[in-house]
């Protein structure tokens, strides 16, 4: 480590660790720069040589959160608890925990090689045709199509069952050894596994109570939205393949896990004459491309007061999938490079609808990072991580409401009326509440793995025991444990944790409420759109610009007025199709859930020789 | 804004027939379900039945066979027909919109 | 046919938290039951307050919830005010039709 890059001396009190914080935050900008510069490099160009690079990088990370972390220890271990200064607390508390930095050097360099070995093999896993040498399919974008707009069971199911084995069934060795590394890092921080740290930066002894409570509120709107959508599927698919009384075959649901299912919003939409809210093919016709759906999520922003994308960002970023056929990693991903000015996105973006509101998503991450880029590094987070998942979600449930899709332009006429808002609250459900049992589950199934109570003879049977549970649906082909089908979602291999977009899908409700009401809005709250409320601008700023230096309790409670996740607004923004769905349910003799749990399709006749291509 | 009002004939002899109306605003009767309620004197709620937003109807089947419900979607009215009235039929009936938009009710009194 | 219990009455005061519950003579009540809790007031006039289980209709205040405690449906009321003294209705679906309780007469000590 550079010696310039070492810690000093400073006084064992705490006017000491003010200096220490001071010296710790300009030496962890650089280090934090040439990681993420080297984490860029080899996500945008995945070579042996990146790789290579990119894990020498997080060595000198390693070093440098060791040597600055033993020293917290040293001189603040256990005084720092008692600091009068809140910020300084939250400082120390994050540079005294070592994470990977705890391993001997040989394993932090296996630690790197196996998160770098993971990344590699999700983002360049390919599924190619039976009996055709040549044709071969990335995940992005030519499986997502597939999944997308294919309505052939076989097709589904050969992209399905293709991606997750490439994906999944390599991963599973090293996943093991992720985890027994990992584990044993974070257990000299304290913690009793991987999953406990991670629970941890949401600050709460009751946070799985609290998250338990939350789903017990939404499960009723799912159960009724996953009725309603199976019913669908029957009446296009038939009795040989959709039970009514049974779970969902995964791979009819228009995306790869199911977790979201606006893309098949063709195939239930309630009321087919009205005007269509879907408006991709809308986009293609007015000739949007990438840079343009970045320009009008910008616009957005700035309407409200934010912060305008810098040219760093314009220059710097990867907003299409590369023609040159460099390997990259395409899922969309917003990166701070800690030195107050680089901010970039990568995103493989296609034109369509749902793009545009990930769009929207990721560029709610970077405008949080120019809000509180100015603080130490340590406080350079959102509030808690359903913070940071939540913002850009905010804006996207504005620029969704058809009556700004015809402010931008992609909806000829808005058409008021009851059909027309069921239409639109059905679309927005296929999104958000289809989403929420995946988000939950998907960290029940990995704090199991860390805690020892999934172990790897289980990692399959307990993800599909969660996803049958939870989601109410069925993998199309009989899996075993040779399957590791968690590897197939980008954010387990990826070592991404995944609660936070659970709580930020309930969490963007409470802040879309309150941000309505500021911008002076008293309709219903799904048709609010705080475009150009300066008022609502200000209130989110307030948010942003505090990062983590506030407990996220403190920071919800003076925007919303609570200081607690709360399922509430999320149910009054879907409650006409919350009333309609339950009508549709009750007329129709529908069963709610899957009493049938254990079903499982057949197999289409002649598969996979006679996929239709 | 959701409204509902019944309008019925107030008294009706025994043996004869009913017929109430409730007209709606501020939703479509092609969207939601409008169910009809009674409350006999001092007495709890009974559930009649429901016509759904596609047309469809179910019934309370103690009431079956006297009972029929219809509606107009574009005059937004939803039409309760009951026949054989006898004495216990008395009370207040009322439509409402899933259940949480009522009508104020009407009173119905089988006397001769 | 399926007989809705709930209890013929409760008494509470201000500020306190009350819950008033649903059984059904068939077993447990589920979401397939489509709990629903509606108030009529002294007035006779009949509001709904939770659609569904857990669903507050529009303008219902915060401190009413609806959820399923064990075997039953429950409508909690946090922070019991005067005004909620009334009377409380539940109503359970069964595959094709609807049955009220006989409903829960709420006395709020002002």
């Known amino acids: 480590l550079d010696p310039g890059l070492q810690p000093g001396n400073f006084s064992a009190d705490e006017a000491g660790a003010q200096l220490f914080a001071q010296s710790y935050n300009s030496s962890a900008e650089q280090v934090l720069f040439q990681s993420v510069a080297a984490s860029w490099a080899h996500d945008t160009n995945i070579t042996a040589e990146n790789a290579r690079r990119q894990e020498e990088a997080a060595l000198l990370s390693q070093e440098f959160a060791e040597a600055w972390g033993q020293k917290a220890k040293e001189l603040y271990e256990p005084i720092w608890q008692n600091f009068t200064d809140p910020q300084l607390r939250r400082i120390i508390g994050a540079v005294r925990t070592l994470g990977s930095a705890n391993l001997p050097l040989a394993k932090r360099q296996q630690y790197n090689a196996l998160l770098s070995n993971m990344s590699r093999i999700y983002s360049t896993a390919k599924v190619c045709l039976p009996n055709k040498t040549a044709t071969c399919w990335s995940l992005d974008p030519d499986l997502t199509n597939i999944l997308a707009s294919s309505r052939s069971y076989a097709m589904l199911l050969f992209a399905w069952e293709g991606w997750h084995n490439a994906a999944g069934i390599p991963l599973k060795p090293l996943y093991e050894d992720f985890t027994a590394l990992s584990n044993e890092a974070y257990k000299q921080d304290g913690f009793t596994d991987t999953g406990a740290y991670w629970r941890s930066w949401y600050n709460s002894p009751t946070f799985e109570d609290d998250l338990e409570h939350l789903y017990q509120q939404l499960e009723p709107l799912y159960l009724n939205l996953h009725a309603f959508v199976r019913r669908a599927l029957h009446r296009r698919y038939g009795d040989r393949y959709i039970n009514l009384r049974g779970p969902i075959p995964a791979h009819l649901l228009g995306d790869m896990w199911a977790q979201s299912w606006e893309n098949i919003y063709d195939m239930v939409v309630p009321f087919p004459d009205k005007p269509n809210l879907d408006v991709t093919s809308t986009m293609l016709q007015q000739g949007w491309n990438a840079t343009h759906m970045f320009r009008v999520a910008e616009e957005f922003f700035t309407s409200l007061e934010l912060s305008p994308m810098p040219p760093e960002f314009w220059e710097g970023s990867m907003l299409e999938k590369p023609a040159d056929g460099r390997e990259v990693v395409c899922h969309a991903s917003a990166w701070d490079f800690y030195n107050r000015k680089d901010f970039r996105i990568k995103q493989c973006t296609r034109v369509t609808m749902d793009q545009l509101s990930t769009v929207h998503h990721e560029m709610g991450h970077i405008q949080y990072y120019l809000q509180y880029k100015d603080l130490p590094v340590s406080l350079r987070r959102g509030a808690n991580p359903g913070f940071h998942e939540a913002i850009g979600d905010v804006l996207a449930l504005s620029v969704s409401t058809p009556e700004h899709l015809h402010k931008i332009g992609l909806l000829d006429r808005v058409t008021n009326d009851t059909e027309s808002d069921i239409n639109y609250l059905l679309k927005m459900a296929l999104e958000k509440i289809a989403f929420l049992p995946f988000g939950y589950l998907v960290d029940q199934w990995r704090w199991g793995v860390f805690s020892g109570r999934t172990p790897p003879s289980r990692y399959n049977f307990d993800w599909w025991y969660l996803r049958t549970k939870y989601q109410g649906i069925c993998p199309p082909v009989t899996r075993n444990e040779t399957h590791f089908d968690a590897g197939a979602k980008f954010h387990v291999p990826n070592v991404t944790p995944y609660i936070r977009y659970f709580v930020s899908f309930v969490l963007q409700f409470q802040f879309h409420e309150a941000l309505c009401k500021e911008a002076g809005y008293e309709g219903p709250l799904h048709q609010c759109d705080i475009y150009r409320s300066t008022k609502a601008g200000a209130k989110l700023r307030k948010v942003l610009q505090a990062g983590s230096s506030r407990p996220w309790q403190e920071v919800l409670k003076d925007m919303v007025g609570l200081d607690a996740l709360d399922a509430q607004p999320l149910l009054k923004y879907f409650q006409p199709v919350t009333q309609w769905l339950q009508e549709q349910n009750q007329q129709n003799g529908e069963v709610l859930g899957w009493p049938e749990y254990q079903w499982h399709p057949p197999l289409p006749d002649n598969y996979p020789e006679g996929i239709d291509l | 804004q959701v409204q509902l009002k019944e309008s019925g004939p107030g008294l009706v002899a025994p043996s004869q027939s009913l017929s109430i109306t409730c007209t709606v605003s501020g939703f479509s009767l092609t969207t939601y379900g409008v169910h009809w309620v009674r409350q006999p004197p001092g007495k709890g709620l009974e559930w009649l039945g429901v016509?759904?937003?596609?047309?469809?109807?179910n019934y309370n089947s103690a009431l079956m066979s006297r009972l029929n419900i219809t509606k107009d979607n574009s005059k937004r009215q939803v039409f309760l027909k009951m026949n054989s009235l006898q004495a216990d039929d008395t009370g207040m009936y009322y439509c409402a919109r899933g259940w949480d938009s009522w009508g104020q009710g009407t009173t119905l009194t089988v006397s001769s | 046919q399926a007989v809705v219990t709930q209890e013929s009455a409760l008494t509470t005061s201000p500020g306190e938290t009350v819950t008033l519950t649903c059984r059904s003579s068939?077993?447990?009540?589920?979401?397939?039951?489509?709990a629903n809790w509606v108030q009529e007031n002294p007035d006779h006039l009949f509001t709904g307050l939770i659609d569904?289980?857990?669903t507050r209709s529009p303008g219902v205040p915060a401190r009413f919830s609806g959820s399923l405690i064990g075997d039953k449906a429950a409508l909690t009321i946090t922070g019991a005010q005067t005004e909620d003294e009334a009377i409380y209705f539940c109503?359970?679906?069964?595959?094709?039709?609807?049955?009220f309780g006989g409903g829960t007469k709420l006395t709020v000590l002002g």
């Open positions: 016509i759904w937003g596609g047309g469809n109807t």
């Open positions: 569904g289980t857990n």
């Open positions: 068939t077993g447990a009540v589920t979401t397939n039951n489509y």
């Open positions: 109503a359970l679906w069964y595959s094709n039709h609807w049955v």
